[in-house]
């Protein structure tokens, strides 16, 4: 009798111990990854970023992947993604090319399976910089809820690289699991 | 052996109340907090904005604290923070000291143990406003996921805060809690 | 004994389950909805966007309801709402009627039970948009955290609705629920 | 440090062109405008025009800009300006630049002599 | 083109004397609350030698009797106390528009 009850509560157990690990033992994936400002490409013209930090100061990953300057995904949900991209400069550094300038970001995904990339959100602004003006800045940000695939992969495309502010708290994106696919 | 099955049972529940109230019966703090207009600081100087409406209008706070101008975190976790900071000029309201703006936001933490501030996020935009134009207007958001331990404090700092638009739709900046610290 | 032990199981498995319909069988609501190009509006002034686009692309919706241009909640609780809004002008697709453009959106909640709408969140910025330039482009995102109920309804306003971006990746709104009401 | 250093002394033919160098090093020479001054004899100082020598975009005063070409080759941070269809006017002396890192030209180079004479 | 008009043309200051230098712009040289007026200094067979950037900020190295003032359209160098080194001609140059333009010079001579 007494063998029989714990075969039930093991049961019972069972059932409660598959919910935990999905609602709560097995944590939500996310990322918060900041700009690797070692590795900027130089240039006006539209790159994607592949240098950025996923363990040092804000920076930080769990249950998602950073490799090749993609962040990857592991689990199969819904996620919130969002970036802050911070354009900045200041004459000491040298001189702008243009004072015309298109500042704008994309965040983007590509699937390997089907070897495509698409954009998900994109922002900026048309910016006219004067030569003048000793500092000049402007931020982005973009965020957006969107269902993602294991292996599929998110990256961050901006023009006018030579322009991105270094810092951890200007330029950066994310993502964090919201709920699970139906 | 019923008092057996009862006893097997409380255990189950117990696990199962526990798991209930970590994940749904203590409920996720949050906090939105909108600007308190009669308390704005004059100048064009970068300043700590302390004055935020918690339970008026679409401000609110749940297992969170507001005090002395800064959103002490009380629970350990894994939030979203965001901030969204309006600026705005009406001829009518006098003119500006100078045309060339730096329209800045600033989101920081403070830890009392480490009695020390850091920026988890800015944004903003250098503006020219021509005396010209009647009226001007500019707004930030900023967002970001961050880990934050109970007892840590978020603030506000922006630039010009006399150009502020006070209205609780436009000026306003909160937290959520989207899971725990593993 | 047997039998009674299965009731008693049936009585944990009972709350197990409703604590598993609530936190994850019963699916956290969810819209994110992309600008439908086909019928947006003209002119300059200030107008509800009411074409969106809710399941092709990117866009999605789940436990949400989508109605005569507005996102109805069926399911009160707390929900991120953000939107990001694009607007953008080509010399090759005509003149500006002005150069001085207010590009603003206001994200509005209307309660059925009390036919009144009220300004959630807005952004956006002045600009000078010179006849001399070939292009321009300008991207605004608001987000905030709101309680909401069950038949309110969400909407977008822009001014000037003929210079909005029609990419899926440019003009969208959504929410997505992150906790119950208390 | 910042040095612009320029080809030497040249002599030419009135009708003729002649193009300049001028090698730059101390800096990144992709992020400053290259200007070109010149001096005509017992003159004042004359501005012709600059490049941004990364993606090559030059600006030109008015005066030159039909005889003036500034170009810049990034491999070797040497920036050229060629004139043509030269008179004896323009003998001159002609400066290459950059600006300090705030404002004003805190960089000059040597100068080349050109003498347009038949 | 922004016209620069130097004066005088030439001027002959003794030892120890105040030496001023005007420069007049055709139309302001003000942009982004600054004033895009710098200041040169040229010996024979030399390079001109930036002294003043932005109407009044004095380059690394330039001597603290060299100052300069002014805004808009009306500026000025001064020389506090003249030394024998300080013969040259001085110029004055705009690049608040493009094409960056230069005054005519003044000759300074040390009596």
């Known amino acids: 009798g007494s063998q029989h009850i714990r075969a039930e509560k093991a049961m019972v157990d069972g059932s409660w111990l598959d919910l935990a690990k999905r609602s709560k033992l097995e944590a939500q994936p996310f990322a918060h990854l900041t700009i690797n400002a070692t590795d900027i490409p130089s240039g006006s013209h539209k790159v994607s970023l592949s240098s950025w930090y996923h363990d040092r100061g804000w920076a930080k990953i769990s249950n998602m992947t950073f490799s090749n300057g993609k962040l990857i995904v592991n689990q199969d949900g819904f996620y919130y993604l969002y970036a802050n991209i911070c354009f900045r400069h200041h004459e000491t550094s040298g001189d702008l090319a243009t004072e015309y300038l298109q500042l704008m970001v994309y965040v983007t995904k590509t699937s390997i399976k089907i070897p495509s990339s698409h954009t998900l959100m994109k922002g900026g602004s048309t910016k006219y910089w004067s030569g003048n003006s000793e500092f000049h800045f402007y931020s982005i940000n973009v965020g957006g809820f969107f269902k993602l695939r294991s292996g599929e992969e998110i990256s961050i495309e901006v023009s006018n690289p030579s322009l991105l502010d270094p810092d951890q708290d200007a330029t950066y994106f994310g993502a964090f699991k919201v709920r699970d696919i139906d | 052996g019923s008092q057996h099955i009862r006893a097997e049972k409380a255990m189950v529940d117990g696990s199962w109340l526990d798991l209930a109230k970590r994940s749904k019966l203590e409920a996720q703090p949050f906090a939105h907090l909108t600007i308190n207009a009669t308390d704005i600081p004059s100048g064009s100087h970068k300043v700590s904005l302390s004055s935020w409406y918690h339970d008026r209008g679409w401000a609110k706070i749940s297992n969170m604290t507001f005090s002395n101008g800064k959103l002490i975190v009380n629970q350990d976790g894994f939030y979203y923070l965001y901030a969204n900071i309006c600026f705005r000029h009406h001829e009518t309201s006098g003119d500006l000291a100078t045309e060339y703006l730096q329209l800045m936001v600033y989101v920081t933490k403070t830890s009392i143990k480490i009695p020390s501030s850091h920026t988890l996020m800015k944004g903003g935009s250098t503006k020219y406003w021509s005396g010209n134009s009647e009226f001007h207007f500019y707004s930030i958001n900023v967002g970001g996921f961050f880990k934050l331990r109970s007892g840590e404090e978020i603030s506000i700092e922006v630039s010009n805060p006399s150009l502020l638009d006070p209205d609780q739709d436009a000026t306003y900046f909160g937290a959520f809690k989207v899971r725990d610290i593993d | 004994g047997s039998q009674h032990i299965r009731a008693e199981k049936a009585m944990v498995d009972g709350s197990w389950l409703d604590l598993a319909k609530r936190s994850k069988l019963e699916a956290q609501p969810f819209a994110h909805l992309t600008i439908n190009a086909t019928d947006i509006p003209s002119g300059s002034h200030k107008v509800s966007l009411s074409s969106w686009y809710h399941d092709r692309g990117w866009a999605k919706i789940s436990n949400m309801t989508f109605s005569n241009g507005k996102l109805i909640v069926n399911q009160d609780g707390f929900y991120y709402l953000y939107a990001n809004i694009c607007f953008r002008h080509h010399e090759t697709s005509g003149d500006l009627a002005t150069e001085y453009l207010q590009l603003m959106v206001y994200v509005t909640k209307t309660s059925i039970k009390i036919p009144s709408s009220h300004t959630l969140m807005k952004g956006g910025s002045t600009k000078y948009w010179s006849g001399n330039s070939e292009f321009h482009f300008y991207s605004i995102n608001v987000g905030g955290f709101f309680k909401l109920r069950s038949g309110e309804e969400i909407s977008i306003e822009v001014s000037n609705p003929s210079l909005l971006d029609p990419d899926q990746d440019a003009t969208y709104f959504g929410a997505f629920k992150v906790r119950d009401i208390d | 440090q910042v040095q612009l250093v320029q080809s030497g002394a040249e002599l030419v033919q009135p009708g003729a062109s002649v193009k300049l160098s001028c090698k730059a090093s101390?800096?990144?020479?992709?992020?400053?405008?290259l200007q070109w001054v010149r001096q005509t004899p017992g003159q004042g100082l004359e501005w012709m025009g600059a490049?941004?020598?990364?993606?090559?975009?030059?600006k030109y005063t008015q005066k030159f800009k039909d005889r003036v070409t500034i170009t810049a080759d990034t491999s070797t941070s040497t920036a050229y300006m060629q004139l043509n269809s030269l008179r004896s006017e323009d003998s001159a002396v002609y400066y290459c630049?950059?600006?300090?890192?705030?404002?004003?030209?805190?960089?000059w180079g040597q100068g080349t002599l050109v003498t347009v004479s038949a | 083109n922004i016209v620069l008009t130097q004066s005088p043309a030439s001027l002959s200051v003794s030892l120890g004397q105040r030496a001023t230098i005007s420069c007049r712009a055709s139309e302001s040289v003000d942009s982004y609350g600054r004033s895009f007026m710098h200041w040169y200094q040229q010996k024979p067979g030399q390079a001109p030698k930036l002294l003043i950037y932005l109407a009044s900020n004095l380059e690394s190295g330039v001597p603290s009797r060299f100052s300069g003032s002014g805004s808009r359209t009306d500026f000025t160098l001064t020389i506090s106390r003249v030394e024998a080194e300080d013969a040259a001609t001085y110029y004055c140059?705009?690049?608040?528009?493009?094409?960056?333009?230069f005054g005519g010079g003044t000759k300074l001579e040390i009596k």
């Open positions: 490049i941004y020598p990364g993606p090559g975009n030059t």
């Open positions: 101390g800096y990144t020479f992709t992020t400053y405008w």
């Open positions: 140059q705009q690049d608040n528009e493009d094409p960056y333009t």
């Open positions: 630049a950059r600006r300090g890192s705030r404002r004003g030209i805190a960089y």
